[in-house]
Interface confidence: medium
């Protein structure tokens, strides 16, 4: 079935259409079984079709590929490698396709791939070389500019015997391939901590979304190298306080906007520096919405309205006077 000339309409292939030999250029009017294609829009949509594999007979013109809502389970090495390569493919959306394993080199031979969305897949096994494609200490730079990895944490019983945070960070840092990454979204992944070296090795980041995780502290995280960072989303975490070092680093970033809503701020004597900083800074968006969660007597108090007299700590009793 021929692609239509209208960018808004798509041609559908008949189910079980015989596919072209993968070594030969796809036919100009080819559209994979169970997909919709628009050559005018340079777009292929294979959405909610329970596909278990990435079609090999994708048209060479594809620039935007949607493979959402399928049952892919695994992306093997070279899952998108074609001869000739899919040289135009710039945006690839694989969200919600039940992927639990992404293997080394899964995105190799996609020279123009700038946006990749793997969100809402339970990635129990993300190869360290999923994005770099090679186990060299320094890989060829990836063309990726946006990497969307929201809600990729697998259920507890499906996780490997290793840190999920560590697995994700290993893939982000392997071979220094993602030096050009500008947007990284890691929301809703139950992250308990952010490994200290991750941000230092992603110097081009403009947007970082860590919202809806379980981050308790940023003490060991350095934002100093992220001189281009424009937005930092830390809403809906478990942050208790931001310490001086973090405050100074954030204040030193020239273009930054920070989002801190819905964290369980502990309004005791350790909060004094942060309150002072909040009153002065322009970088925190919606700072007037930030409220205390603890201690009980401070619950729901607005941070900006606190003064030093409000922020006290219970005296630490000598061991002899402590009770169990």
């Amino acid at each position: 079935s021929s692609p239509t000339s209208s960018a808004s309409s798509f041609s559908s292939s008949a189910p079980f259409l015989a596919s072209a030999v993968s070594a030969q250029p796809p036919l100009p009017d080819q559209c994979p079984a169970l997909c919709e294609c628009s050559e005018a829009a340079r777009t292929v949509k294979c959405v909610n079709r329970n596909l278990t594999e990435v079609p090999t007979d994708l048209p060479a013109y594809v620039r935007n590929l949607f493979l959402t809502g399928n049952q892919l389970a695994v992306l093997p090495a070279g899952a998108f490698a074609r001869r000739p390569p899919l040289a135009e493919l710039a945006a690839l959306n694989l969200s919600g396709s039940r992927l639990d394993e992404v293997r080394a080199g899964a995105f190799e031979h996609l020279p123009s791939l700038r946006q990749l969305d793997l969100s809402h897949n339970p990635l129990a096994d993300l190869s360290p070389f999923a994005f770099s494609g090679s186990n060299a200490s320094v890989s060829a730079p990836s063309p990726l500019v946006e990497l969307i990895l929201n809600h990729i944490v697998p259920p507890e019983d499906e996780r490997q015997n290793r840190s999920f945070e560590g697995m994700v960070v290993a893939a982000l840092l392997a071979g220094r391939a993602l030096q050009g990454l500008r947007r990284l979204e890691l929301a809703s992944n139950h992250f308990l901590y952010l490994p200290r070296d991750v941000l230092a090795q992603l110097p081009s980041l403009r947007h970082l979304d860590l919202s809806n995780n379980s981050l308790v502290s940023l003490t060991y995280v350095s934002f100093r190298n992220l001189t281009h960072l424009e937005s930092l989303h830390l809403e809906d975490n478990a942050l208790k306080v931001l310490h001086n070092g973090t405050l100074a680093e954030l204040q030193g970033l020239p273009h930054i906007r920070v989002f801190l809503d819905n964290n369980p701020w502990v309004c005791d004597c350790h909060m004094a520096d942060m309150v002072t900083w909040l009153k002065e800074t322009e970088v925190v968006q919606g700072k007037d919405r930030l409220t205390c969660a603890y201690p009980e007597k401070m619950r729901n108090r607005v941070l900006l309205e606190l003064n030093s007299a409000d922020l006290d700590c219970d005296p630490i009793l000598p061991p002899s006077l402590q009770t169990s």
Partner: antibody
């Protein structure tokens, strides 16, 4: 009983063509990937080609790309291998073998008895 | 491409012997490894999959182990029916077989 039966082998001259067939029975053919594997005389096993259950996913070993074409007819429970521009080094027993549901995430758990292809002048 | 290297190429053993065949992958394949048995003039038969899982109907004297790049097939007590050629196969990226190990009578 799960069964795969190959046919279509024979003697052919270099540059010639053959079409191999594999008839499947005893399982839901349309839900499994299928493969061709070959074994040259006195040699080991070599995977040749893979086809996904809907025919949208096809892979070949480099040495046959552009010469061999794998296909399937789910209505007939049949797998095919069209072999063109045959070379001496294509001489082998060709086995049809069943894979899994997706990609190469499953070993080859059912094999046919094989059909012999001899390329010789 | 992933290469698979088996050793030894030939193994002479007697009935009752414990036999071990090794297979090495050129890069990590996790546990995506299978073992096959082939007798002359016959098709290969699947013995082990996912490195250590025994295929239904295969005698328990066959076992597999390993992960990453190093794998082992063990026959705990060699039986007369076990003299054959054994192949390992990775299925992490496409399919690749080892060159085979022939187990012959000593």
């Amino acid at each position: 009983e799960v069964q795969l039966v190959e046919s279509g082998g024979g003697l052919v001259q270099p540059g010639g063509s053959l079409r191999l067939s594999c008839a499947a029975s005893g399982f839901t053919f349309s839900s499994r990937s299928m493969n061709w594997v070959r074994q040259a005389p006195g040699r080991g096993l070599e995977w040749v080609s893979y086809i996904g259950f809907s025919s949208s996913t096809i892979y070949y070993v480099d040495s046959v790309k552009g010469r061999f074409t794998i296909s399937r007819d789910n209505a007939k429970n049949s797998l095919y291998l069209q072999m063109n521009t045959l070379r001496d080094e294509d001489t082998a027993v060709y086995y049809c073998a069943r894979g899994g549901v997706r990609y190469f995430d499953h070993p080859l758990d059912v094999w046919g008895k094989g059909t012999t292809v001899t390329v010789s002048s | 491409d992933i290469q698979m290297t088996q050793s030894p190429s030939t193994l002479s053993a007697s009935v009752g012997d414990r036999v071990t065949i090794t297979c090495r992958a050129s890069q990590s394949i996790s546990s995506w490894l299978a073992w096959y048995q082939q007798k002359p003039g016959k098709a290969p038969k699947l013995l082990i999959y996912k490195a250590s899982s025994l295929e239904s109907g295969v005698p328990s004297r066959f076992s597999g182990s390993g992960s990453g790049t190093q794998f082992t097939l063990t026959i705990s007590s060699l039986q007369p029916d076990d003299f054959a050629t054994y192949y390992c196969q990775q299925y992490y990226s496409y399919y690749t077989f080892g060159q085979g190990t022939k187990v012959e009578i000593k």
